[in-house]
């Protein structure tokens, strides 16, 4: 059996973040059992976790991971140097910042060391797999009697991120949401002083520096409203 490695030729669906290849399945021997899919996420461009479902194996197997970057100066095959484990079985690999090259095609290969012919190769666009840390330091400023401005910080370059702000009052059953671009500022023009408001924000590595689909975690919520401090009506930020 020969391993098939898919090399993109420009005609693939470039919206896909990975291409998957595996061994031909012309028989049901151990060597042709499909390997689990590897999922990689780059956290705030600080480190990357590539994980797989180790429990999908018919018997506990310490699968090994190799990686390289296609058509680049970093095309030398590298072994995983920091495995992640689930119940003492390999279930992932963690790569550090210096090993992450966002705009080169990342090739990851999973292999069964007991059956070297049993392997699967995926190609990933890492810039589409970045998940930033949640926004921090939410603050509210009262711009006028009825207008609030929400600000926040991110632990990444602002211009690489877009944001989603959600807010609601204690009287609302659902959140109202608003998209915010890299300027990361949100104004609520009409605030009812009799209601208590809750705001939260999440961020995404899109569209300038990548095309990630996954959002960060939500920020801690921040509150404003009828039971807030009367001492300074122009600046009040209370974290839950």
């Amino acid at each position: 059996l020969n391993t098939t490695i898919l090399t993109p030729n420009g005609n693939e669906d470039t919206t896909a973040d990975f291409f998957l290849t595996t061994m031909p399945t012309d028989s049901l021997s151990v060597s042709t059992l499909p390997l689990p899919e590897v999922q990689c996420f780059v956290f705030n461009v600080e480190y990357m976790n590539c994980t797989w479902n180790s429990s999908s194996e018919p018997q506990p197997t310490n699968l090994t991971l190799h990686y390289w970057y296609k058509n680049s100066d970093n095309d030398k095959v590298q072994k995983c140097s920091h495995y992640l484990f689930s119940e003492e079985i390999t279930s992932g690999c963690q790569l550090q910042k210096k090993e992450i090259h966002l705009y080169q095609t990342f090739v990851v290969q999973l292999q069964d060391p007991r059956e070297p012919r049993r392997q699967a190769t995926q190609m990933l666009k890492l810039q589409n797999l970045v998940i930033p840390w949640a926004p921090e330091n939410l603050t509210l400023h009262k711009l006028s009697e009825s207008q609030l401005e929400l600000n926040w910080n991110n632990r990444f370059l602002n211009h690489c991120l877009e944001h989603l702000v959600q807010y609601r009052t204690d009287w609302d059953h659902s959140w109202t949401e608003q998209s915010v671009d890299y300027r990361h500022k949100f104004s609520l023009p009409s605030v009812d002083g009799q209601k208590r408001y809750t705001f939260r924000v999440r961020s995404r590595f899109n569209p300038l520096c990548g095309s990630a689909q996954h959002w960060s975690e939500w920020s801690h919520p921040i509150h404003w409203g009828s039971n807030t401090s009367k001492e300074n009506p122009f600046l009040f930020a209370l974290e839950a």
Partner: nanobody, 117 residues
Framework: QVQLQESGGGLVQPGGSLRLSCAAS????????MTWARQAPGKGLEWVST????????AYAASVEGRFTISRDNAKSTLYLQLNSLKTEDTAMYYC??????????PGQGTQVTVSS
């Protein structure tokens, strides 16, 4: 190796215009976002603008928004920055960098923009 060659700077009066260019080689230009940054005399490197790899998205520092326009020609591996309504505070050395401007890729030699009457 990566090479970035900026050009197009010069001396211009306030309110004037310039078009900066950056010729790139040694990497797959069309795969990378590209960034312009600048350094005024005695100051640190300041991010100016970034453009997505396909040119479809752009971002600008508040100080230049509405006056500067970033663009790119992937077929020519060239990055541009159109500077309009120039102010004296725009005087700086302008650099293009590969990527989103995180400070890690070394910029090129730069091109000097001087705004003075």
């Amino acid at each position: 190796q990566v090479q970035l060659q900026e050009s197009g700077g010069g001396l211009v009066q306030p309110g004037g215009s310039l078009r900066l260019s950056c010729a790139a080689s040694g990497f797959t230009f069309s795969s990378y976002p590209m960034t312009w940054a600048r350094q005024a005399p005695g100051k640190g490197l300041e991010w100016v603008s970034t453009i997505a790899s396909d040119g479809g998205s752009t971002a600008y520092a508040a100080s230049v928004e509405g006056r500067f326009t970033i663009s790119r020609d992937n077929a020519k591996s060239t990055l541009y920055l159109q500077l309009n309504s120039l102010k004296t505070e725009d005087t700086a050395m302008y650099y293009c960098t590969k990527g989103y401007g995180d400070g890690t890729p070394a910029p090129g030699q730069g091109t000097q923009v001087t705004v003075s009457s």
